[in-house]
Amino acid sequence: KAMHVAQPAVVLANSRGTASFVCEYASPGKATEVRVTVLRQADSQVTEVCAATYMMGNELTFLDDSICTGTSSGNQVNLTIQGLRAMDTGLYICKVELMYPPPYYMGIGNGTQIYVIDPEPCPDSD
């Protein structure tokens, strides 16, 4: 069977352009090293948003310039994406790979539709 990865269907970013969701995977074995990748799918185009490899029980480490942060707890990864704008609305897909020990397993979630609404500019005060 494919490794099952679950994530919420819909999330609304807050007024600061931040969206959070949980990516949960059903691990077939006792993985110690896990790689999580967030992919954005829009109009059949797929781009990588961010990725992190972590050791079970340790924090996720994204690149310094990444728009993602996250924490892990067991087979759950809590992901936060920052700096989103209306044009970033799309399907954000969680891809999980169990890197070590062998055998390798991989699963892909069905995606979280993230809606981003740009805030209205404040009216000028006289």
């Epitope: 494919a2 799918q41 781009t47 891809k95 892909i108 069905n110 995606g111």
Partner: nanobody, 126 residues
Framework: QVQLVESGGGLVQPGGSLRLSCAVS????????IGWFRQDPEKEREMVSC????????KYADSVKGRFTISRDNAKNTVYLQMNSLEPEDTAVYYC???????????????????WGQGTRVTVSS
């Protein structure tokens, strides 16, 4: 444990034909993409052709359209790549890849592939 085993590579003269096979085991799902990719030492791995298990949607690289044909035999869990009118530029190691997707995922997108075979070498030379 998912395993993909390629066969059928070899040395062929320009204008000749080969048929590659990819046998899949250890994976059971109604939905997946299986693709053929190739790589030579100077280049990144590129998708040559791909087929979706359900519905049979196919995708081809522009460089092989009209020359290569992908097909599948679900009963044998095997995917084939018929390569005709081979050119020296087709020389590479050919890999079979599997993407454990669902209907929401874009057809045959390289980001969704995670399981790979060991590769079979194709050499086109006179």
């Amino acid at each position: 444990q998912v395993q993909l085993v390629e066969s059928g590579g070899g040395l062929v003269q320009p204008g000749g034909s080969l048929r590659l096979s990819c046998a899949v085991s250890g994976f059971s799902s109604d939905y997946y993409d299986i693709g053929w990719f190739r790589q030579d030492p100077e280049k990144e791995r590129e998708m040559v052709s791909c087929i979706r298990s359900s519905g049979g949607s196919t995708k081809y690289a522009d460089s092989v359209k009209g020359r290569f044909t992908i097909s599948r035999d679900n009963a044998k869990n095997t995917v084939y790549l018929q390569m005709n009118s081979l050119e020296p530029e087709d020389t590479a190691v050919y890999y079979c890849g599997l993407a454990p997707i669902s209907p929401v995922h874009a057809v045959c997108n390289q980001h969704y592939f995670g399981y790979w075979g060991q590769g079979t070498r194709v050499t086109v030379s006179s």
